[in-house]
């Protein structure tokens, strides 16, 4: 067990301090300081007595409170009441209260910044490649190619909004049909999903925090592929969205509308672009099979140019190649016309870091991609930490309550759809699914927000940032309306029919009962959380995506026994935990499976074997660090300094009453004081709002 | 300044060939494209064909194919224009010609003008 | 080929008089024209391109105009020295080819 503070010694009267407490509560020995004890006894107890910032803190809950995983962790209040605060007390509480929103709103501002960043990185580091997906011809023909590259795509390019608007390009110039670009937009809503489920694992350093973050994220994952599950066979067989987004677009004569509010990046661009400014244009031209944009760099250089417009006179092989057959002479010996080309002189250069460098789009992007996840990582961290102090006691039961309560009986129903109602609303305001569910990701984690909550949270996420393209397509230009806003339509609707397939009736909820088994899993063994990633994200539609290129034949026989065996998988499961009679006795479990077939066990043995050089050189520099060691390694002796690991480790293995993570404590300082590694210090006392 | 020399006059036998040459200076040889013309007496202007010295393209009226061949000698910046199988109806004044308005088949510089009798 | 029909064939007119030459195209030539003068046994002269463009050293009492199929040369005030046949061209299409010609003469 990791150094505690001993609260029988530490306090005369526990049940003062202790939660619920009804006399004396079984304290969990300090097996560690046993050993290396001095005599001076009280040194811990003074400890402990100068500091009332953590004094209340409870650090053993009964062990009934958590036994489920999933329940809301209490999220105690350590401070002095305010009606117990004298004048400057108050002032200082008030200006420290002041002081956290700021740098709350600060890291926030940062923590959106950094997801733009990341997106931009990403774009850099594989948005050449993702146009080359689009530029594969048997899109047209193939379903599931169309959704494995709208899914790798957007993965690529970190922005559902960049692979739609290539494919409303595509189909306004005919590239492509709305019947084929149907599965890139249901790939395209996978892929968005991938940068909540990167923000979840931020929060790794915390078993049960990750364990609801993770779940929060991969809700709206699940979401999506189980959507795509049912809906693309659908659309497929009867085109229901293709033929409902027709007639809408038909039976309206629609105007060109303005564009849609940009509201939270015009907060953000000016920062944004200061680290680095792309020319989105290159990706498209790319996917459009403009030979001339595989050379191009997605950097922008330029920011301001001037485009003149003149006629030029080229030679033509025969007077037929003319651009008009007044516009055609000769000179004796070859045929003449003129072209209308536009000459794009630049006049200032933007003003961004990687303006003056010349690095190769792929290096600029790995630079991005280090820095935005550790800027990303950083953030959540301080927001986690910032929102951990300010949502005790009052303030947090307040907020628990108005955002995970029902309305009252018979209106109980309502509060989901309400949800989903502000989902929406938050997502069209921040224009940005992602941003939106990023920023609701560490709110489950620390438990401000239940996953019942967050599911139609997240759903009407979706439907925001469908909104906010059907109002972009009506600001497109007249040749790319209709397209653009069929291609929407068809994204609004799919949302929809997923809603309708899995919210309604709380039986159909199957997003959140899978989300919280990955949570599960992913909390005992990390390194799953990133497999799920690669696997998902990565591998499946590479997969897919080359047996596709191979050919039907090939997809289908792959393909079908590979189904078989899921769904055999899945029956089976389902008649084991409902009817097992019915199986013979050797099916009614899977022992008959060999132990690495049925058990993630002896693959975390070989995960652990793998990452066990990580562990030697492991990191007591910085908490940020810890959390990516933690992830990597699941690592029991990782980095104690900065607690992320070894506390929580002994503290889950072995211990009958389960003792609160760390994190109870106000901040790092306070936890790392309570466990003898950094001296008191009486300065410092906590503050809460309420 | 630019200046066109061509050849002097000559008398041909029905049959025979006839090549006229057209020494230039003042200008890059290679620069521009050199247009061969003939007129006959009291009549009109009749377009022979071209050639481009830089690379010895030539282009020719569809009505003298087969017939005339055009060639540039950079060495001496001089172009011939040789018509063969001459009949009493290509008795002209043969006229060499550049066109110094660059992409333009209107021509600005043209030679003296050679004199071809064809009579038997 | 493009024919390009030239009126009238001759006239005879007064020092200072305003001369009309037409040219038409038997298909669109675009801008394609230019007009040459070439007096008695000398070589033709350019005077005008690109249907209005007055060749350098010519002067501006000649003035071309014209698109398409119909194509004019205007000598504002005819003098002395403008007496000569004047021929129009086209260089839309190979082969090139020129007006029959209309001589100019002072009465």
């Known amino acids: 067990m990791a150094p505690w503070p001993e609260l029988g010694d530490a306090q005369p009267n526990p049940d003062k301090y202790l939660e619920g407490a009804a006399g004396q509560q079984p304290t969990a020995p300090d097996k560690s300081k046993e050993t290396n004890k001095t005599d001076n006894t009280e040194a811990p107890v003074t400890k402990i007595e100068l500091l009332p910032s953590y004094s209340t803190a409870t650090l053993i809950d009964e062990p009934t409170e958590v036994d489920d995983p999933w329940n809301l962790p209490t999220l105690q209040d350590s401070g002095i009441k305010w009606s117990e605060r004298d004048t400057k007390g108050k002032i200082l509480c008030f200006f420290q209260g002041i002081g956290r929103l700021i740098l709350l709103l600060g890291f926030l501002y940062f923590f959106v910044c950094s997801l733009d960043i990341l997106s931009s990185a990403f774009q850099l580091v594989g948005g050449k490649m993702a146009g080359q997906f689009f530029s594969n011809s048997s899109i047209m023909s193939n379903p599931l190619l169309g959704l494995v590259i709208g899914v790798l795509v957007t993965v690529l390019v970190q922005s559902s909004s960049t692979s739609t608007s290539i494919v409303v390009s595509m189909v306004s110039s005919s590239l492509l049909t709305v019947r084929a670009a149907i599965p890139i937009i249901m790939g395209a809503n996978i892929g968005t999903s991938i940068t909540n489920t990167i923000v979840a694992l931020m929060q790794v350093g915390d078993r049960s925090e990750f364990r609801r973050a993770f779940a929060g994220a991969t809700v709206h994952d699940f979401f999506n592929w189980l959507s795509v599950l049912v809906l693309l066979p659908v659309e497929v067989a009867t085109h229901y969205l293709e033929i409902i987004t027709q007639l809408i677009v038909e039976s309206f004569h629609f105007k060109n509308g303005e564009d849609a509010p940009d509201l939270l990046k015009v907060i953000t661009k000016p920062f944004t672009k200061l680290i680095v400014q792309l020319d989105k244009k290159v990706i498209s031209q790319i996917a459009m099979n403009d030979e001339k944009a595989k050379n191009k760099s997605l950097v922008k250089i330029w920011c301001k140019t001037f485009t003149n417009k003149t006629q030029i006179n080229v030679t033509v092989p025969s007077t037929a190649n003319c651009t008009s057959p007044s516009l055609c002479w000769t000179d004796g010996i070859q045929n003449w016309t003129m072209k209308n080309v536009t000459y794009k002189e630049n006049i200032a250069k933007c003003q961004h870091i990687f303006v003056n460098f010349h690095l190769p789009d792929l290096a600029v992007g790995t630079i991005l991609l280090i820095l935005s996840l550790l800027v990303l990582c950083g953030c959540l961290i301080m927001i986690v930490k910032i929102l951990g102090s300010v949502l005790k006691g009052q303030v947090a039961t307040v907020i628990k309550k108005t955002i995970n309560t029902d309305f009252p009986f018979p209106f109980a129903w309502l509060t989901g759809y309400l949800a989903i109602l502000v989902g929406a609303g938050m997502t069209f305001i921040v224009q940005s699914s992602s941003v939106f569910t990023s920023a609701l990701t560490p709110l489950i984690g620390i438990g401000v927000i239940t996953i019942e909550r967050a599911y139609p949270l997240t759903l009407g996420s979706n439907i925001g940032t469908t909104t906010t393209a059907i109002l972009a397509a009506l600001a497109s230009p007249g040749n790319a309306l209709r397209s653009s806003l069929q291609i929407a339509l068809c994204h609004f609707f799919f949302n929809i029919s997923g809603i309708l397939l899995w919210y309604p009736i709380p039986f159909t909820r199957l997003p959140i009962r899978m989300a919280k088994g990955l949570g599960n899993i992913s909390a005992k063994y990390r390194w799953f959380a990133v497999f799920y990633l690669i696997i998902f994200f990565f591998l499946i539609p590479l997969t897919v995506f080359g047996l596709s290129l191979a050919g039907w034949r090939v997809l289908v026989g792959v393909g079908v026994p590979v189904v078989f065996i899921i769904i055999l998988v899945l029956c089976l499961r389902l008649l084991q935990s409902r009817c097992p009679r019915v199986l013979p006795k050797k099916l009614q479990n899977w022992n008959f499976l060999p132990l690495w077939m049925r058990s993630l066990k002896p693959w975390d043995a070989v995960v652990s074997k793998f990452t066990g050089c990580f562990q030697m050189r492991c990191c007591c520099c910085c908490r940020v660090c810890c959390r990516a060691c933690c992830l990597l390694c699941d690592c029991p002796k990782c980095c104690r300094c900065s607690k992320c690991c070894e506390d929580l480790e002994e503290a889950q293995e072995g211990q009958d009453v389960p003792v609160k993570a760390p994190e109870t404590f106000d901040n790092i300082t306070i936890s790392r004081e309570a466990q003898g590694e950094v001296p008191a210090s009486d300065s410092k006392t906590e503050c809460t709002a309420l | 300044q630019v200046q066109l020399v061509q050849s002097g006059a000559e008398v041909k036998k029905p049959g025979a060939s006839v090549k006229v040459s057209c020494k230039t200076s003042?200008?890059?040889?290679?620069?521009?494209?050199m247009h061969w013309v003939r007129q006959a007496p009291g009549q009109g202007l009749e377009w022979i064909g071209a050639?481009?010295?830089?690379?010895?393209?030539?282009s020719y009226n569809q009505k003298f194919k087969g017939r005339v061949t055009m060639t540039a000698d950079t060495s001496t910046s001089t172009v011939y224009m040789e018509l063969s199988s001459l009949r009493s109806e290509d008795t002209a004044v043969y006229y060499c010609s550049i066109s110094t308005i660059i992409t333009t088949g209107a021509v600005d510089y043209w030679g003296q003008g050679t004199l071809v009798t064809v009579s038997s | 080929d493009i024919v390009m029909t030239q009126s009238p064939s001759s006239l005879s007119t007064s020092v200072g008089d305003r001369v009309t030459i037409t040219c038409k195209a038997s298909?669109?030539?675009?801008?394609?024209v230019a007009w040459y003068q070439q007096k008695p046994g000398q070589s033709p002269k350019l005077l005008i391109y690109?249907?209005?463009t007055r060749h350098t050293g010519v002067p501006d009492r000649f003035t071309g105009s014209g698109s398409g199929t119909d194509f004019t040369l205007i000598i504002r005030s005819l003098q002395p020295e403008d007496v000569a046949t004047y021929f129009c061209q086209q260089y839309s299409r190979i082969p090139l080819t020129f007006g029959s010609g209309t001589k100019v003469e002072i009465k």
């Open positions: 003042g200008y890059t040889f290679i620069t521009y494209n």
């Open positions: 050639i481009y010295p830089g690379s010895g393209d030539t």
């Open positions: 690109w249907t209005s």
């Open positions: 298909q669109d030539v675009g801008t394609a």
